[in-house]
Amino acid sequence: EVEKTACPSGKKAREIDESLIFYKKWELEACVDAALLATQMDRVNAIPFTYEQLDVLKHKLDELYPQGYPESVIQHLGYLFLKMSPEDIRKWNVTSLETLKALLEVNKGHEMSPQVATLIDRFVKGRGQLDKDTLDTLTAFYPGYLCSLSPEELSSVPPSSIWAVRPQDLDTCDPRQLDVLYPKARLAFQNMNGSEYFVKIQSFLGGAPTEDLKALSQQNVSMDLATFMKLRTDAVLPLTVAEVQKLLGPHVEGLKAEERHRPVRDWILRQRQDDLDTLGLGLQGGIPNGYLVLDLSMQEALS
């Protein structure tokens, strides 16, 4: 807390300018009017205030706006934003995408801080849903943003926003998140033709059900092994050897290198060895010839 002291004669700030960086902490507190600071916030970022001086400026704004800063001030916070606590930010009402962009720019190149996470949460809740422009902005600054949301939060993403998603934005998503995003992507890209559709839907396929994988296998898509390895195990297991061969195309040879890893390992265990042998890859572990395969799941469904 800065002590209240009278401003020395002739030092009262008439505007926010570079001369203030030579003021000591107590002089800044005594000689800079909070209302003047608020109206000239756009100048603060251009002035190299020290880490310690920024504390004083924040303190002045906190006194002026105890219920939270107005958006006109928030938009121009610049590096002062990094001095804010999540508690400070929860008092704000940020509605403008320009304000959000300005504050994200300050944190650019750094990991998502608790301040940024709180800011985004306030902004998205204020908008009611994660619209395309917002998602565009957030993933541009934080490629992993989508995957930081819970499946419940992702359910508020409209299918139209999926067009803003790039493959790298989904790198850290887990299957539960892809389960939510895949149907939205399928809806968003439904009017595209085969090859274009596959390029767009590919990064979402970790949430695809068996029937969609079967459909893709009929379209000569040549799925790469990296994508195949991210598919849901339960979606891959019912696929026949012929379907997997069609799905992977020339990439089918890569199965050999992955035969000990899921989902390939589990899929092999479900296939007849005879069928696996037709691939000519030397895959082992299938059901031996002459064995009867009982589909227990079907049996349970009937009983």
Epitope: P48, E52, Q53, L54
Partner: antibody, heavy 120, light 106 residues
């Protein structure tokens, strides 16, 4: 990791200009930091000389009056010190250093330093 | 400008001994920074924001203080800690350094 390397002549004549270069690797001088020059006199006293900010703006120690200029070449990721009208009092080890925060506070990264002797 | 006065100017300690050095400021500060410098090397940041340890600094180093009085403590002196230690402020311009405390090993 961020690395800074000073270079320049080790001997300068009185009344001439001292010019030094700081080459930076591992970070861009246009990223959100402050790039400083600091010197250490023979008695070990340290003095901050000035900085060039990520946006190209400067600030200098008032004690150096109008003798100092810090500039940069973003294409080479280098920044420069020029000190005019040197005297023997300017004999020192000169360091370039990068700020450790988003606002001026502490010096997190230092070059290894270069000794400059001012002598006739 | 803010003047920083370090004391003592020179001190010595035995291995395992606790060492404390101080830095006094001519005006009240919120943060103090500490550096270690060994002969022939550049200063190395030890402590930032008064008490936070910089990356790679052993936990035997600690910083404390407020207002105009700050200190650096080494809980158990080791031979490699023999060096000169500087405090630094950047509360307002220009930033300034203390004159240093030279720590020798007994």
């Amino acid at each position: 990791d961020v690395q800074l390397q000073e270079s320049g002549p080790g001997l300068v004549k009185p009344s001439q200009s001292l010019s030094l270069t700081c080459s930076v690797t591992g970070d861009s001088i246009t990223s959100g930091y402050y790039w400083n020059w600091i010197r250490q006199f023979p008695g070990n006293k340290l003095e901050w000389m000035g900085f060039i900010r990520f946006d190209g703006t400067n600030n200098y120690n008032p004690s150096l009056k109008n003798r100092i200029s810090i500039t940069r070449d973003t294409s080479k990721n280098q920044f420069f010190l020029k000190l005019n009208s040197v005297t023997t009092e300017d004999t020192a080890t000169y360091y370039c250093a990068r700020e450790g925060s988003y606002a001026p506070a502490w010096f997190a990264y230092w070059g290894q330093g270069t000794l400059v002797t001012v002598s006739a | 400008q803010i003047v920083l006065t370090q004391s003592p100017a020179i001190m010595s300690a035995s291995p395992g001994e606790k060492v404390t050095m101080t830095c006094s400021a001519s005006s009240s500060l919120s943060y103090m920074y500490w550096y270690q410098q060994k002969p022939g090397s550049s200063p190395r940041l030890l402590i930032y924001d008064t008490s936070n340890l910089a990356s790679g600094v052993p936990v035997r180093f600690s910083g404390s203080g407020s207002g105009t009085s700050y200190s650096l403590t080494i809980s158990r002196m080791e031979a490699e800690d023999a060096a000169t230690y500087y405090c630094q402020q950047w509360s307002s311009y220009p930033p300034t350094f203390g004159g240093g405390t030279k720590l020798e090993i007994k």
